[in-house]
Amino acid sequence: SEVEYIAEVGQNAYLPCSYTPAPPGNLVPVCWGKGACPVFDCSNVVLRTDNRDVNDRTSGRYWLKGDFHKGDVSLTIENVTLADSGVYCCRIQIPGIMNDEKHNVKLVVIKPAKVTPAPTLQRDLTSAFPRMLTTGEHGPAETQTPGSLPDVNLTQIFTLTNELRDSGATIRTA
């Protein structure tokens, strides 16, 4: 199942995807498409790279802002709208026979929440990120609130909370 990423309307969405160039600097073509990964390449391509640089972008809202030359091909969609919601395919086109790495991720764009008085930390984390960490490998995903987060300490929660606030996005798996 796809990992879900949540962004508010008007914010930037960040969809992670990466690979390790081997040897370093030996880049491979990558495509991002709207819709699940098809049999080959990407459908409804929004951005494409070649062995050197981004060579195709369907809109100025799509960017690779990470260190592309180190294999960070995470997609940033600027100023998202509800229409940007859906599954995206990141395909790392490693040369060879049926060698590609395929990653489907789901973007959920939500309307901005109304401003309310800040609740307690426990309630804030639970309501803001109710499905932040879930188990998607074995059957239906199971919600885990911060009270039952496995192997996560408060420092990690604070760090993650701040990062998510900065990016305007949250993460969950479906």
Epitope: A36, P38, V39, S43, V45, D50, Q93, I94
Partner: antibody, heavy 119, light 108 residues
């Protein structure tokens, strides 16, 4: 106008080899994925193989994997299919086809070349 | 692999009538990655529909596609003499690419 012209078909004995060519014109060849699709006499369509615009990525049907090799020469605007260890069940019309700019389906097809595998 | 089953095998209709062709997949076709082709005797196939419902360039609007998941339909609203042919569906959501066995639309 997009044109695809296949050649290289013919009669070959089981276990033999054949190389099909497809000369393309009317579009920027190196920008598009290309595919081979075959059709046995009186039967339906069967996808055989596909190759990316650069030639770096290739895909094959299980029925031909390890026996057929797809390649392309972008300087000559030509697509190839090298067929080895041919079997009677490979007898078919082989079509060269251009993938749509949004790949995985085929918007232009050649007229096909007949490959007959028989002793 | 995804098996596509087309029905009926043969459709006997008269010019001017409506044709409804079905394509059923053995498992869900992701993102409606389904195309339809037309093939006349002795000719190469011709792309009609992709993405389940988008008409290819130059295809008359009497051809329309619909459906999602496992059930897809090609509709020809009013058959013209040149529409009598074999029609194939093809999925491209799951490896390998696969085609249905075809539906023949013949003159009644």
């Amino acid at each position: 106008e997009v044109q695809l012209l296949e050649s290289g078909g013919g009669l070959v004995q089981p276990g033999g080899s054949l190389r099909l060519s497809c000369a393309a014109s009317g579009f920027t060849f190196s920008n598009y994925w290309m595919s081979w699709v075959r059709q046995a006499p009186g039967k339906g369509l069967e996808w055989v193989s596909a190759i990316s615009g650069s030639g770096g990525s290739t895909y094959y049907a299980d029925s031909v994997k390890g026996r057929f090799t797809i390649s392309r020469d972008n300087s000559k605007n030509t697509l190839y299919l090298q067929m080895n260890s041919l079997r009677a069940e490979d007898t078919a019309v082989y079509y060269c086809a251009k993938d749509h700019w949004d790949p995985n389906f085929l918007d232009y097809w050649g007229q096909g070349t007949l490959v007959t595998v028989s002793s | 692999e995804i098996v596509l089953t087309q029905s009926p095998g043969t459709l006997s209709l008269s010019p001017g009538e409506r044709a409804t062709l079905s394509c059923r997949a053995s498992q869900s076709v992701s993102s409606s990655y389904l195309a339809w082709y037309q093939q006349k005797p002795g000719q190469a196939p011709r792309l009609l529909i992709y993405g389940a419902s988008s008409r290819a360039t130059g295809i008359p609007d009497r051809f329309s596609g619909s459906g999602s998941g496992t059930d897809f339909t090609l509709t020809i609203s009013r058959l013209e003499p040149e529409d009598f042919a074999v029609y194939y569906c093809q999925q491209y959501g799951s490896s390998p690419l696969t085609f249905g066995q075809g539906t023949k639309v013949e003159i009644k």
